[in-house]
């Protein structure tokens, strides 16, 4: 089995995690990509994902997570803004390739968030000016691909009923053209 390596990030509450996950350009440029948390016992869970197919350089915001897929450079940029202590954990970038398991992009990210703002802006936060709030929207990310419960045969898309609102409101700096991708619940 391949040894899974980790890269450790130690940040303070309120700061921004900013990571870049490289992928093979020709093969995966337009593939849908996701940011996952690794729960106890090697149980990955998707937290946010890009559109399907993934669009070039379009930031997708899901709660406090922002994903940007740079096709030209073969990298997925992931930002988690306004970090909380509870965000501490093990994360990974993956490329969706259903029906197979997602393809993991090395390395995994070991995030450690501690109390107390350091006084210096987190990465990608140049100043406290020009900060604008993105309020909770009425849409969510397009991560659920199939309806639930699912069958072996092709399942219908989720109905557009019962679309609810993500509950986090975030502060961002120098982020333009953020799109919200709807989820069909």
């Amino acid at each position: 089995a391949t040894k899974l390596t980790e890269e450790k990030y130690e940040l303070k509450e309120g700061q921004t995690l900013d990571v870049k996950c490289d992928y093979t350009l020709e093969k995966f440029a337009s593939s849908q990509k996701a940011w996952q948390i690794i729960r106890d016992g090697e149980m990955p869970k998707t937290l946010a994902c890009t559109e399907r197919p993934s669009k070039n350089s379009h930031p997708v915001q899901v709660g406090r997570i922002i994903l940007e897929d740079y096709h030209d450079h073969g990298l997925l940029r992931v930002r988690m803004v306004n970090l909380q202590v509870e965000d501490s954990g093990l994360y990974q970038c993956v490329i969706y390739q259903p029906p197979k398991e997602p393809h993991m992009l090395f390395d995994r990210i070991r995030l450690v968030v501690t109390k107390g703002f350091s006084g210096t802006p987190g990465s990608n936060e140049n100043s406290t000016q020009n900060v604008y709030k993105i309020p909770p929207t009425t849409t969510k990310a397009l991560c659920p691909l199939y309806t639930s419960p699912r069958t072996v045969t092709q399942a219908p898309p989720k109905s557009t009923a019962d679309v609810s609102t993500p509950d986090s409101e975030i502060n961002l700096t120098n982020v333009t053209d953020i799109i919200r991708v709807p989820v069909f619940n």
Partner: antibody, heavy 123, light 112 residues
Framework: QVQLVQSGAEVKKPGASVKVSCKAS????????MHWVRQAPGQGLEWMGI????????SYAQKFQGRVTMTRDTSTSTVYMELSSLRSEDTAVYYC????????????????WGQGTMVTVSS | DIVMTQSPLSLPVTPGEPASISCRSS???????????LDWYLQKPGQSPQLLIY???NRASGVPDRFSGSGSGTDFTLKISRVEAEDVGVYYC?????????FGGGTKVEIK
């Protein structure tokens, strides 16, 4: 349709072990996590652990560490929960439950439940 | 571990009337993605639990629209707009924000 069918009721003596099976059908078995939850008579629900049917990795509630073992057989789309060193307090209905979100989903509720297996521990 | 506290313990209801169940968690269930990892289940007498609401406020497939979930962070509510006789049973909230998954103690809904 999607369903989980569990093995029949068991009566065990204290100190013995029990192995409950849960056969999945109607979906891709290896794509969804499976959980085990138990319910003592007249009591609430208690989470025991989770297994990833794809790789077989597991995570158990602290309370059951060392006594519980969850395994799977991908050829028959079946997961198993074995509980050892049984005591009277382990008398309960044991449920397997599928986690709604697969690798590609955000949600993580238990959307499909087995019918339950009654395990009675009595001398 | 996250502790889930439900109230009331028992809820006598009149058919056609609204009902409300509260669930409180010892830690926030709001994830970085803006979703609250809180689900509601109904266990009817002699049956396995069934999913009603997931991610705090999303109705599961086939669940009547008289059921709704709300709340964020640590305080959540399940509402039944007009109780029907078939709604009797024990209602549980469950958090899946962090392992171990934990359930509330349950609220028994019965017809007056």
């Amino acid at each position: 349709q999607v369903q989980l069918v569990q093995s029949g009721a068991e009566v065990k003596k204290p100190g013995a072990s029990v192995k409950v099976s849960c056969k999945a059908s109607g979906y891709t078995f290896t794509s969804y996590y499976m959980h085990w939850v138990r319910q003592a008579p007249g009591q609430g629900l208690e989470w025991m652990g989770i297994i990833n049917p794809s790789g077989g990795s597991t995570s158990y509630a602290q309370k059951f560490q060392g006594r519980v073992t969850m395994t799977r057989d991908t050829s028959t789309s079946t997961v198993y929960m074995e509980l050892s060193s049984l005591r009277s307090e382990d008398t309960a209905v044991y449920y397997c439950a599928r986690e709604a979100g697969n690798y590609y989903d955000i949600e993580s509720a238990f959307d499909i439940w087995g019918q339950g297996t009654m395990v009675t521990v009595s001398s | 571990d996250i502790v889930m506290t439900q109230s009331p313990l028992s809820l006598p209801v009149t058919p056609g009337e609204p009902a409300s169940i509260s669930c409180r968690s010892s830690q926030s269930l709001l994830h970085s993605n803006g979703y609250n990892y809180l689900d509601w289940y109904l266990q009817k007498p002699g049956q396995s639990p069934q999913l009603l609401i997931y991610l705090g406020s999303n109705r599961a497939s086939g669940v009547p629209d008289r059921f709704s979930g709300s709340g964020s962070g640590t305080d959540f509510t399940l509402k039944i707009s007009r109780v029907e006789a078939e709604d009797v049973g024990v209602y549980y909230c469950m958090q899946s924000r962090n392992a171990p998954w934990t359930f509330g103690g349950g609220t028994k809904v019965e017809i007056k």
